[in-house]
């Protein structure tokens, strides 16, 4: 049994780090493998993560890591019974993937303005709470070419756009994702999308 693709890990900088790897053949990850992780710090002990299957030869492990700070560094040991398959380390602050925003809502009752709001995925006491910026993706279900991204570089989890910038009388979907420049994070996953019917009064044209 060998590791084909070494574990790579990302942290949500709140409570979970997720590590994924591939074995050289079909593996029952939860029965055959264990990922041990230990904070390199005073009086720290190793904790055990039981991996789950992620495709035939793929494994994924969700490591519990709370109260993460920038100095934290973990050693990682991947075991198959008594055999050490791989040894590495992981610094959560250098591999941050924020949680996805939630509760995306489109408010269509504001005089020809669309107001999109969503929830910050972190509690106010988390370091990332005040450091997230967002990208909002809006697309038409009818026209694949009608696809746009709005960058929200301010902290407020909302976006206002004129309804007239979109076509009237058709359905649109929106989704949102987040990143944090301070830790040069990757983008979060997209939030679940929300759908609405775009309709607005065409301005009266005089001839």
């Amino acid at each position: 049994m060998k590791v084909l693709q070494e574990p790579t890990c990302v942290s949500d900088y709140m409570s979970i780090s997720t590590c994924e790897w591939k074995m050289n053949g079909p593996t029952n990850c939860s029965t055959e493998l264990r990922l041990l992780y230990q904070l390199v710090f005073l009086l720290s002990e190793a904790h055990t993560c039981i991996p789950e299957n992620n495709g035939g030869a793929g494994c994924v492990c969700h490591l519990l890591m709370d109260d993460v700070v920038s100095a934290d560094n973990y050693t990682l040991d991947l075991w198959a019974g008594q055999q050490l398959l791989w040894k590495g380390s992981f610094k959560p602050s250098e591999h941050v993937k924020p949680r996805a925003p939630g509760n995306l809502t489109v408010h269509t009752n504001v005089s020809d303005t669309l107001l999109l709001t969503w929830s910050n995925p972190y509690p106010p006491d988390n370091y990332l709470y005040n450091h997230l910026t967002y990208a909002v993706n809006i697309w038409s279900e009818n026209d694949p070419a009608d696809f746009r991204i709005y960058n929200v570089t301010y902290l407020e989890p909302s976006l206002r756009i004129a309804a007239s910038t979109l076509k009237s009388g058709i359905s649109y979907r929106a989704r949102v994702r987040a990143w944090a420049q301070c830790y040069n994070t990757t983008w979060s996953e997209w939030s679940p999308s929300t759908k609405w019917h775009n309709s607005y009064r065409e301005p009266f044209e005089q001839h």
Epitope: L39, F41, L42, L43, S44, E45, H47, L64, M65, D66, D67, V68, V69, A71, D72
Partner: antibody, heavy 119, light 107 residues
Framework: EVQLLESGGGLVQPGGSLRLSCAAS????????MSWVRQAPGKGLEWVST????????NYADSVKGRFTISRDNVKNTLYLQMNSLRAEDTAVYYC????????????WGQGTLVTVSS | DIQMTQSPSSLSASVGDRVTITCQAS??????LNWYQQKPGKAPKLLIY???RLHSGVPSRFSGSGSGTDYTLTISSLQPEDFATYFC?????????FGGGTKVEIK
């Protein structure tokens, strides 16, 4: 909700022994280092001892080394402090505290139990 | 052992005041500096860990800063419930050590 409840304090004569307990609930006890911190009447805080999450590592303040023993039972979710050869200067409120991910930060504290060493 | 020197040992302030408490370590503690609040007859509560990280549920008027040997706790606008004693603690080296405390009293 994290809860820590100390017990076992009381009046003891110099040279005597006492065993403190701290019952933990509201979190996965076996994941966190635990500590004892004490406070003499009208004084500041003094760290006494810390034990790692699985009990493999312990450390003590010089003032109690060789006299006090910290231990834990991860099945019963309980932290202990065995105090022997007690001295008048050990008189204090003893708090048990749960760590953050790092053993040296005291995230949650019990209400404390008073130990009085006097003849 | 690392000595933690806290100052002032006491201060008087009014509601709404900005309050600053300092803590100096006898050697570099690599940002492993924690702040606790204690009210009479009660257990201490963690406010800030690792110099500037707010513990869960702590109001944002509390903030921490510093590096190396010098650290600061700031209360941006003192509230009635903030009158208490504050302790710093280094978590970089065993044995763990606390500052002597700063009592914040009503002016």
């Amino acid at each position: 909700e994290v809860q820590l409840l100390e017990s076992g304090g009381g009046l003891v004569q110099p040279g005597g022994s006492l065993r403190l307990s701290c019952a933990a609930s509201g979190f996965t006890f076996s994941r966190y280092a635990m500590s004892w911190v004490r406070q003499a009447p009208g004084k500041g805080l003094e760290w006494v001892s810390t034990i790692s999450s699985g009990g493999s590592y312990t450390n003590y303040a010089d003032s109690v080394k060789g006299r006090f023993t910290i231990s834990r039972d991860n099945v019963k979710n309980t932290l202990y402090l065995q105090m022997n050869s007690l001295r008048a200067e050990d008189t204090a409120v003893y708090y048990c505290a749960r760590a953050t991910a790092r053993a040296t930060e005291f995230a949650y504290w019990g209400q404390g139990t008073l130990v009085t060493v006097s003849s | 052992d690392i000595q933690m020197t806290q100052s002032p040992s006491s201060l008087s302030a009014s509601v709404g005041d900005r309050v600053t408490i300092t803590c100096q370590a006898s050697q570099d503690i690599s940002n492993y500096l924690n702040w606790y609040q204690q009210k009479p007859g009660k257990a201490p509560k963690l406010l800030i860990y690792y110099t500037s990280r707010l513990h869960s549920g702590v109001p944002s008027r509390f903030s921490g800063s510093g590096s190396g040997t010098d650290y600061t706790l700031t209360i941006s606008s003192l509230q009635p419930e903030d009158f208490a004693t504050y302790f710093c603690q280094q978590g970089n080296t065993l044995p763990l050590t606390f500052g002597g405390g700063t009592k914040v009293e009503i002016k």
